[in-house]
């Protein structure tokens, strides 16, 4: 319904980089790493290590690249189809809950229980009952026993967006 | 959770300029672009106009091009929307909202969040 800007009215500063290439949209979408134009006719690419799309789309802009924050490691760089992978440091964690910031994982397990899951960069140190085998969620208890944890070894990539 | 604060509207006269500005909190304001949107009484939302996360890039309907201006102060978490030329049929409830991007059809995409909106009445 709304006729949009096209690259012609936009100032020098906001038309696209020459290296921005551009492809025509396939029934009024665009491939990944691309975004439509403000006049639908074209597909612009996104700028490599600043934003990206993951999907065919008719969004008006990239999406920004995520930043690893300090804590966090950056397992992959930003492509202009694929957002930055993050993981936190060795020995924190990132919950699911507070997906925000890594947390530093437990050095050991409360009196009366286990050690049956090392720390990994998306879950605690995993602590049961000795005698009930039951999980352990509570907060790091006042007092630990001697039984610590090593830092776990990567498995899986936890990429936030954002 | 991002908080939009907005100020700025209020009554002019049909011809003249208002400009209104929204402030962000809560999270990186430079992760976001920015869309202003529109509902005047009885009326479906409308989109108004949008900016990228970096500024670079806009976007403004066909209903206002050439009069109204969408911008961006990364430094001061802020967008605006400068309005000039208005006519009478401008008259709505204005409110800004944040996206990761928004499609032409003004749809927000990912997580958005919206300010609690501003009255322009323009009086002919």
């Known amino acids: 319904e709304s006729a949009l800007i096209t690259q012609q009215d936009l100032a020098p500063q906001q038309r696209a980089a020459p290296q921005q290439k551009r492809s025509s949209p396939s029934e009024g979408l665009c491939p990944p790493g691309h975004h439509i134009s403000e006049d639908g006719r074209d597909c612009i690419s996104c700028k490599y290590g600043q934003d990206y799309s993951t999907h065919w789309n008719d969004l008006l802009f990239c999406l920004r690249c995520t930043r690893c924050d300090s804590g966090e490691v950056e397992l992959s760089p930003c492509t202009t189809t694929r957002n930055t992978v993050c993981q936190c440091e060795e020995g924190t964690f990132r919950e699911e809950d507070s997906p925000e910031m890594c947390r530093k994982c437990r050095t050991g397990c409360p009196r009366g229980m286990v050690k049956v899951g090392d720390c990994t960069p998306w879950s605690d140190i995993e602590c049961v009952h000795k005698e009930s085998g039951t999980k352990h969620s509570g907060e790091v208890p006042a007092v630990e026993e001697t039984v610590t944890s090593s830092p776990g070894t990567p498995a899986s990539p936890c990429s936030l967006s954002g | 959770q991002v908080q939009l604060v907005q100020s700025g509207g209020g009554l002019a006269q049909a011809g003249g300029s208002l400009r209104l500005s929204c402030v962000a909190s809560g999270r990186t304001f430079t992760n976001y672009a920015m869309g202003w949107f529109r509902q005047a009484p009885g009326k479906e939302r409308e989109f108004v106009a949008a900016?990228?996360?970096?500024?670079?890039?806009?976007y403004h309907a066909d209903s206002v091009k050439g009069r109204f201006t969408i911008s961006r102060d990364n430094a001061k978490d802020s967008v605006y929307l400068q309005m000039t030329k208005l006519k009478p049929e401008d008259t709505a409830d204005y409110y800004c909202?944040?996206?990761?991007?928004?499609?032409?059809?003004?749809?927000?995409?990912?997580?958005?969040?919206w300010g609690q909106g501003t009255q322009v009445t323009v009086s002919s």
């Open positions: 900016i990228n996360w970096s500024g670079d890039s806009t």
């Open positions: 909202a944040s996206a990761e991007s928004f499609s032409r059809g003004g749809l927000p995409y990912g997580m958005n969040y």
